[in-house]
């Protein structure tokens, strides 16, 4: 956030940039948390825009019995590996076809016995506040579906009738990793020393990191005709004086008519 300065006072302004602001010859360049001519004001809203999508990765092992292991399968650039990858990917795409969060599979290792396939199942969902529940549900469905297919698609008399057959007992889920996104934590961190006063509020399922000085939210502080200003002790209303009134009180809601104090015939000198 920048504020431009014109005229003779500029050099004087330069040495007075506050809160880590730097002078660029024309104006104070303020760090993210501040604005104003001297970077003296604390912003009332911090952009913590979530990622568009959140990902999860499940580390799985299945044993494919309809392909016999050969040494070439260890080499990821071999024709054998590429053909195996093609069939395995097609098979898994069919298995997980009913899961909207399913993105694909990534084979990490093939090893002997018949072919033990260490692989990742990749999941992705649009960010919403409920993303953890959505991905948790998706991982449960993945477990159900892979268990079902490795139980049903099995060799009979050393022959497979399906695209791939599996060893029922060779299916394992090793690990599940979900990309962590914690808007409350991000908000607190980015607000630094003002972290106690910034909160996350949702609008159209999007998180906003705001202080009570930001209007239009449930936590917004109503300063009436005054100005909300953030300090290390929290948000405060700076009350204004108009031609006719003085305003006071915590929310500047108490107006005192000047004429009642000075009398009707007070003269300005």
């Amino acid at each position: 956030r920048t504020t431009t300065c014109f005229g003779d006072g500029c050099q004087n302004t330069a040495s007075r940039c506050k809160n880590g602001g730097t002078w660029d010859g024309l104006k104070c360049q303020c760090p993210n948390l501040y604005y104003g001519e001297l970077c003296e004001e604390v912003v009332s809203s911090i952009d913590i825009g979530p990622p568009e999508t959140i990902s999860a990765q499940m580390e799985l092992t299945v044993t494919v019995t309809s392909v016999k292991f050969t040494e070439e399968l260890k080499n990821h650039s071999s024709q054998e590996f590429q053909e195996f990858k093609q069939t395995f990917t097609e098979q898994m795409n069919i298995v997980y076809s009913g899961i909207p969060e399913y993105v694909g599979v990534n084979i990490t290792k093939l090893r002997l016995g018949s072919v033990v396939v260490e692989h990742d199942v990749l999941l992705r969902t649009k960010y919403t506040p409920e993303y953890k529940t959505v991905l948790d549900n998706a991982t449960e469905v993945v477990k159900e579906k892979i268990t079902k297919v490795t139980t049903q698609q099995i060799m009979i008399n050393d022959i497979c009738s399906d695209m791939m057959c599996f060893n029922t007992t060779g299916t394992q889920v090793q690990n599940i990793t979900v990309t962590q996104y914690d808007p409350e934590e991000d908000c607190r961190k980015m607000a630094k020393e003002y972290g106690d006063y910034f909160v996350v509020e949702y609008r159209d399922q999007k998180p906003y990191c705001i202080s009570p000085c930001e209007p239009g939210f449930s936590v917004s502080k109503n300063c009436n005709l005054g100005k909300c200003q953030m300090s290390l002790s929290g948000p405060q209303c700076l009350c204004v004086t108009t031609e006719t009134h003085w305003y006071s009180g915590e929310t500047c809601n108490q107006g005192t008519q000047k004429s009642l104090v000075y009398g009707h015939h007070h003269h300005h000198h």
Partner: nanobody
Framework: EVQLVESGGGVVQPGGSLRLSCAAS????????WGWFRQAPGKEREAVAL???????FYADSVKGRFTISQDNSKNTLYLQMNSLRAEDTAVYYC?????????????????WGQGTMVTVSS
């Protein structure tokens, strides 16, 4: 790039014989799996006879004792000797291959295919 070209199809009377050939290029017969599949009009493609580099062979129940799969590694050619042909053997016959040592009858697991050769058994 793997190329498979079938030949030897034709019209034959019931009880007659035919020998199908599949010439392969870009591929070594000493590895992987080879097979013959067929597809009759209005039906799904089905495995007829399969062979793998580890010596495993498979024959569909309907052709056992009548058909024989073999290969000539020096010529990189796969064969299907068909004897005692019946009307129900009428179909387009396809040669298939994979560098993987397969144990599956499902055509979706086979990566390389020829264009097919027609076999008609009719009196």
């Amino acid at each position: 790039e793997v190329q498979l070209v079938e030949s030897g199809g034709g019209v034959v009377q019931p009880g007659g014989s035919l020998r199908l050939s599949c010439a392969a290029s870009g591929f070594t017969f000493s590895r992987g799996s080879w097979g013959w599949f067929r597809q009759a009009p209005g039906k799904e493609r089905e495995a007829v006879a399969l062979i793998s580099s580890d010596g495993w062979t498979f024959y569909a129940d309907s052709v056992k004792g009548r058909f024989t799969i073999s290969q000539d590694n020096s010529k990189n050619t796969l064969y299907l000797q068909m004897n005692s042909l019946r009307a129900e053997d009428t179909a387009v016959y396809y040669c298939a291959a994979s560098v993987l040592v397969l144990r599956t009858l499902n055509p979706k697991a086979w990566h390389h295919w020829g264009q097919g050769t027609m076999v008609t058994v009719s009196s």
